[in-house]
């Protein structure tokens, strides 16, 4: 079932404790063993699991993908999902842990040649609704990367977002992908809109700094829905 | 911050059906994944459904797979649960909760870290 599967998968949370406002401090008080965090509502047990729905991996955390939890799932069935570790299987870099990549089909750590000289690199994008298959057209293209401990620069080639140093993200640029700027208050950004809609980008754009997020350009609101700007706006 | 309030509840026979709203305000409501969770007396609190903050993606327990229906509206910040088909089971307090974004805030596991103060759903036989 479901449950089953996700049960391993999700960080697990408990309501505020009784009298406690939403997103107001309360008084700490745990029905489970697990993290409580200072003020507000935000408690962190094991009681039972969450899946968290998402549609891209941006969606999850950095230690997670976003993908059906079942094997030839319900595509309309997609959650934040444990990262894969070394040797295990993939079939994209996003499902392997910071630090690996997806190569041949199974997460290998990018420092196997130490993060010196040349490498070739295998970077598949697909472009098929459901973003966690192979399914539907993929382009495969050779890259020839330097990668060193330092974190990538603008422009630099990258596997996710870790890759990149602070303030950069790792999004598709062509048929590759390369560290971007974080995108800055003002700035356009992109709502996906259609579930899968982000993989038919050749020029993604970052996400939204830290306090911003992507919403309708409050002068576009009566434009129609195609023609919306969004753009990066505070909380 | 953001506040969610829960409303809908209320008694139902068995049978019969409810429509859960849950309102958001504070921060930007369309960012989070949204879900909705429930406890019985003397039970521990389990999930029930999530949509994803596109509405692109939806889950289910399966004790309500088919009878119950997630929905949201971003442009009132509200999210919906539909409960056909109410069972004496399904009597609890439901808990509506939002999620963080994952790694667009910087965290390794997406996670709920919002919650409501619910509302109280009772199905009698």
């Known amino acids: 079932t479901l449950n089953s599967v996700l049960n391993s998968n999700a960080i697990k949370n408990l309501p505020p404790p009784l009298g406690g406002a939403a997103g107001h401090p309360g008084s700490a008080v745990s029905a489970a063993p697990g993290i409580l965090y200072p003020g507000g509502n935000k408690y962190q047990t094991i009681d039972n699991y969450q899946p968290y729905p998402c549609a891209e991996d941006e969606e999850c955390g950095t230690d997670e993908y976003c993908a059906s939890p079942t094997r030839g799932g319900d595509a309309g069935v997609q959650i934040c999902l444990a990262c894969r570790k070394r040797r295990k299987r993939c079939m994209r870099h996003a499902m392997c842990c910071p630090g690996n990549y997806c190569k041949n089909g199974i997460c290998v750590s990018s420092d196997q040649n130490h993060f010196r000289g040349e490498i070739e690199e295998t970077i598949t994008e697909s472009f098929g609704n459901d973003h966690s298959t192979l399914d539907g057209y993929s382009r495969r293209t050779t890259l020839s990367s330097k990668m060193y401990h330092t974190k990538g620069q603008e422009g630099s080639v990258c596997l996710r977002s870790s890759d990149c140093a602070s303030g950069l993200c790792c999004a598709r640029h062509f048929w590759s992908k390369i560290c971007k700027p974080v995108l800055k208050e003002g700035q356009v950004c992109t709502k996906h809109r259609r579930k899968g809609s982000h993989g038919l980008e050749i020029f993604q754009r970052c996400y939204c700094g830290e306090g911003l997020s992507c919403r309708i350009q409050k002068d576009h609101h009566q434009a129609s829905n195609s023609s919306r700007l969004h753009t990066c706006q505070r909380h | 911050e953001v506040q969610l309030v829960e409303s809908g509840g209320g008694l139902v026979q068995a049978g019969g059906s409810l429509r859960l709203s849950c309102a958001a305000s504070?921060?930007?409501?369309?960012?989070?994944?949204m879900g909705w969770f429930r406890q019985a007396p003397g039970k521990e609190r389990e999930f029930v459904a999530a949509?994803?903050?596109?509405?692109?993606?939806?889950v289910y327990a399966d004790s309500v797979k088919g009878r119950f229906t997630i929905s949201r509206d971003n442009a009132k910040n509200t999210v919906y649960l539909q409960m056909n088909s109410l069972k004496p089971e399904d009597t609890a307090v439901y808990y509506c909760?939002?999620?963080?974004?994952?790694?667009?805030?910087?965290?390794?596991?997406?996670?709920?870290?919002?919650w409501g103060q619910g509302t109280q759903v009772t199905v009698s036989s």
């Open positions: 909760a939002a999620g963080n974004g994952g790694r667009t805030y910087g965290h390794s596991r997406a996670r709920y870290d919002y």
């Open positions: 504070g921060r930007t409501f369309s960012s989070y994944a």
């Open positions: 949509i994803s903050w596109s509405g692109g993606s939806t």
